[in-house]
Interface confidence: medium
Amino acid sequence: GITIPRNPGCPNSEDKNFPRTVMVNLNIHNRNTNTNPKRSSDYYNRSTSPWNLHRNEDPERYPSVIWEAKCRHLGCINADGNVDYHMNSVPIQQEILVLRREPPHCPNSFRLEKILVSVGCTCVTPIVHHVA
Amino acid sequence: GITIPRNPGCPNSEDKNFPRTVMVNLNIHNRNTNTNPKRSSDYYNRSTSPWNLHRNEDPERYPSVIWEAKCRHLGCINADGNVDYHMNSVPIQQEILVLRREPPHCPNSFRLEKILVSVGCTCVTPIVHHVA
């Protein structure tokens, strides 16, 4: 197997004071077959609240690439193909878990991190505030 | 918290032959302030492709609770508040990382797993297949 040189500052799995640490097997069980969101569907183009997918890359995170949705319009596309500003395109957000090296550069030590990502957009009726 | 009975077959964190594992600190660094999807927005009710949020709970998984979106209608809500079947409500899916206890009931041993979840719904123009 691989022997990775140990960083002297890396936590030791035998350290009983190492906070809330678990062993994680890296043989990922993947229940999905298609992992590229751009190929998995064309909803981002066909939606009445279309969006673009932006590549968010961070080599020190797992997964290193996360796709972020940005709504194309403030309004929504109507039946004529025009933007209707009486409706709003809004991002649907999801909190996801990622792994980040901690301490940095330790090959076998990570911390869980929660980040909020925009997955796609939906068309909503706006909240109208009436001024008396 | 929940105390899970220890499975006698749980791998030992001191076992140097434990296959392809890393140490993961579960003290999550959370960059977000709001973690309840039902409170984070009311888009699921105001959308032209509204959805219900279903609680998917699995004590053998981390996080144990995941919210799954199910579109309320096949069609989309039009300006009159009726369902328009010339348009389609479709789920927006996202691949997320979870930790699965392995072997089951081991408090400190997990396997990485990728699962596909529906985060919300969007309204799309249907793909119409014309028969010659």
Partner: nanobody, 119 residues
Framework: EVQLVESGGGLVQPGGSLRLSCAAS????????MYWVRQAPGKGLEWVAN????????YYVDSVKGRFTISRDNAKNSLFLQMNSLRAEDTAVYYC????????????WGQGTLVTVSS
Amino acid sequence: EVQLVESGGGLVQPGGSLRLSCAASGFTFSSYSMYWVRQAPGKGLEWVANIKQDGSEKYYVDSVKGRFTISRDNAKNSLFLQMNSLRAEDTAVYYCAKGEILPLHFDYWGQGTLVTVSS
């Protein structure tokens, strides 16, 4: 879009040498560890070698140690595998892959280049 294109495969006699190349684009090449993996006919994917971002650390599967050398040129976004003293059991499709921070994990790989070692 991430692209990895391997080249340099071919037919070689036992004991011979080959140099595989991989041209990378669509990502920050110098920020990622890179891998060579291979798939022999009718077998699963096998990790062969990997190299850290700056080229300072290299790791090899036991069966190729002393015979194969992995290297990279970050200025040219290129990965290489120098294969010497080739054996029949090295016959496989060789893929270059972009690494993730988790050990032995990669998220993109190329179309592969076939190496056949036969007399």
